[in-house]
């Protein structure tokens, strides 16, 4: 007869174990009983479990409550045993020694291997913001036995970096990944991807990139300056720019108090009908955490009655 | 045939020792875990202590721990128990058994006795 | 410890009498028990062992059933010889543990 077992046997933590150990025999063979043992070098055997033909399942103090046979129908040549809820301590060498009659004593060793999945971490770096050079945007740390993969998935372009450090029974790996902030990257998402075999799919923790910036500003509302002229209504200008944090606008005139009867309202200024009084210098004034921005417009608010008046000078002038 | 002979009780004061001996005879002795049971006088049966055929595994009860002392010879096919610090409630009649070793520290039950040895602790 | 509680403590039964004596252990011991027969001044006599198996040169009409914590030790038909008290063991773990014994005196 023979032994038939596995040379690894594969478990998650808090699963069951199967330890499998089945003697094939010849007819009219008996198994009188079978001892399991845990015997990882430099150690002494340390007793499972002792399943006998007629006194049943002994269990080691150790590990009562944890053995037990596999369920019926059992096959009285099979001593394999179950390891209920398998922790990472239990990762080691097993043997299991069958007492056979009368082909006598055979013995068989297997690995149990615990899979410790990784419950991975994502930590944000420090605030990004635009202008600044290489820049740590996340790291992402996960611990496992044996030590996860950690990768990135973005298609903002960076550069990642990982180290490992060991421990007695698992591994710890944590991946950076760099960038030189930009506004494009803005509200991008940024995936720290972890697979490991104890894993049935990859575990994926994704953090949207926030990249501080302020844009130029500029006034939009003057392109045409023959629209600038007394009495009419409607006029108004608009102060551009964009940034994140989502900027603030605040409107002030350079040579003077803003008339009476002209409204802001955030990033516009809205004018009443024009008069003589509303030409100046405007200032719109972008500021948000990141930095601050000023543009300046000159209004011309034109007196109709003056450029006819001016025009038929010309003309009589000519 | 398989015999187990146990000699060494008698009359001992409190505090006193006694060295008992338990020759065995017809089986193969070193294979074998030998004990000592106990039972005093109208009384159950108390296990008292164990020894593995090769001495390596010893086990006493609590109530004897640190007072008794397991030994064998096996050259001698002999089996023994030093008791020392004697008290009145280790008066008993001492038996000696064997059992077969299964595997690690498990074995069956004890399948052939002595006849036993008295012993009284008694001022 | 394992306790182990035998009932009854002791009984009167006939010659021919089948008669049952239980045994409970404070834990599961498989079939880690013995049952064994003592009469006065001699050494206990291993009966049964392994809970159920019959010890070489002891009687068919003692048999033995159980495992786990509930255990039975019965006698189909009392002979004159069989008057004796029983003991209970579980050798499951160390310390081995006996029942109080049960005494079978005759009615």
């Known amino acids: 007869g023979e032994l038939e077992t596995s040379d690894v046997v594969t478990v998650v933590l808090g699963q069951d174990a199967k330890l499998p150990c089945f003697y094939r025999g010849d007819s009219g063979e008996q198994v009188g009983q079978v001892a399991w043992a845990r015997v990882d070098a430099g150690e002494g055997a340390q007793e499972l479990a002792l399943l006998h033909s007629k006194y049943g399942l002994h269990v080691s103090p150790a590990y009562e409550g944890r053995v037990e046979q596999p369920p019926p129908p059992r096959n009285p040549l099979d001593g394999s045993v179950l390891l209920r809820n398998a922790v990472q301590a239990d990762e080691g060498e097993y043997e299991c020694r069958v007492s056979t009659f009368p082909a006598g004593s055979f013995q068989a060793r297997l690995r149990l291997r615990v899979l410790v999945p990784p419950l991975p971490s994502l930590n944000p770096g420090p605030a990004l913001e635009e202008g600044q050079g290489l820049t740590l945007a996340a790291s992402c740390t996960a611990e496992g036995s044996p030590a996860p993969s950690v990768t990135w998935d973005t298609e903002v372009k960076g550069t990642t970096s990982s180290r490992s450090f060991k421990h007695s029974r698992s591994a710890a790996v944590t991946s950076e990944f760099h960038l030189v902030p930009s506004r494009s990257m803005n509200g991008q998402p940024l995936t720290c991807v972890v697979s490991h075999p104890g894993l049935l799919q990859d575990q994926r923790i994704t953090h949207i990139l926030h990249v501080s910036f302020l844009a130029e500003a500029s006034v939009r509302g003057l392109e045409d300056q023959n629209l600038w002229h007394i009495g009419r209504e409607g006029a108004m200008l608009k102060c551009l720019s964009e940034g994140q944090p989502p900027p603030s606008y605040n409107w002030t005139r350079l040579d003077g108090p803003l008339p009476s009867g002209v409204r802001v309202d955030g990033d516009t200024l809205g004018f009443p009908p024009l008069t003589t009084e509303h030409s100046g210098i405007y200032v719109c004034h972008v500021s948000n955490e990141f930095s601050s921005r000023d543009s300046q417009v000159t209004v011309d608010v034109l007196d109709p009655q003056e450029d006819s008046g001016k025009q038929v000078d010309l003309v009589s002038a000519s | 045939e398989v015999q187990l002979v146990e000699s060494g009780g008698g009359l001992v004061q409190p505090g006193g020792s006694l060295r008992l001996s338990c020759a065995a005879s017809?089986?193969?002795?070193?294979?074998?875990?030998m004990s000592w049971v106990r039972q005093a006088p109208g009384k159950g049966l108390e296990w008292v202590s164990r020894i593995s055929g090769d001495s390596a595994n010893i086990r006493y009860a609590d109530s004897v721990k640190g007072r008794f002392t397991i030994s064998r010879d096996n050259s001698k096919n002999t089996l023994y128990l030093q008791m020392n610090s004697l008290r009145a409630e280790d008066t008993a009649v001492y038996y000696c058994?064997?059992?077969?070793?299964?595997?690690?520290?498990?074995?069956?039950?004890?399948?052939?006795w002595g006849q036993g040895t008295l012993v009284t602790v008694s001022s | 410890d394992i306790q182990m509680t035998q009932s009854p403590s002791s009984l009167s039964a006939s010659v021919g009498d089948r008669v049952t004596i239980t045994c409970r252990a404070s834990?599961?011991?498989?079939?880690?028990l013995a049952w064994y027969q003592q009469k006065p001044g001699k050494a206990p006599k291993l009966l049964i062992y392994a809970a159920s198996s019959l010890q070489s040169g002891v009687p068919s009409r003692f048999s033995g059933s159980g495992s786990g914590t509930d255990f039975t030790l019965t006698i189909s038909s009392l002979q004159p010889e069989d008057f004796a008290t029983y003991y209970c063991?579980?050798?499951?773990?160390?310390?081995?543990?006996f029942g109080q014994g049960t005494k079978v005196e005759i009615k």
């Open positions: 017809g089986f193969s002795f070193g294979t074998y875990g």
């Open positions: 063991q579980q050798h499951y773990t160390t310390p081995p543990t």
């Open positions: 058994a064997r059992a077969e070793l299964l595997a690690f520290d498990v074995y069956t039950a004890s399948d052939y």
């Open positions: 834990q599961g011991i498989s079939s880690y």
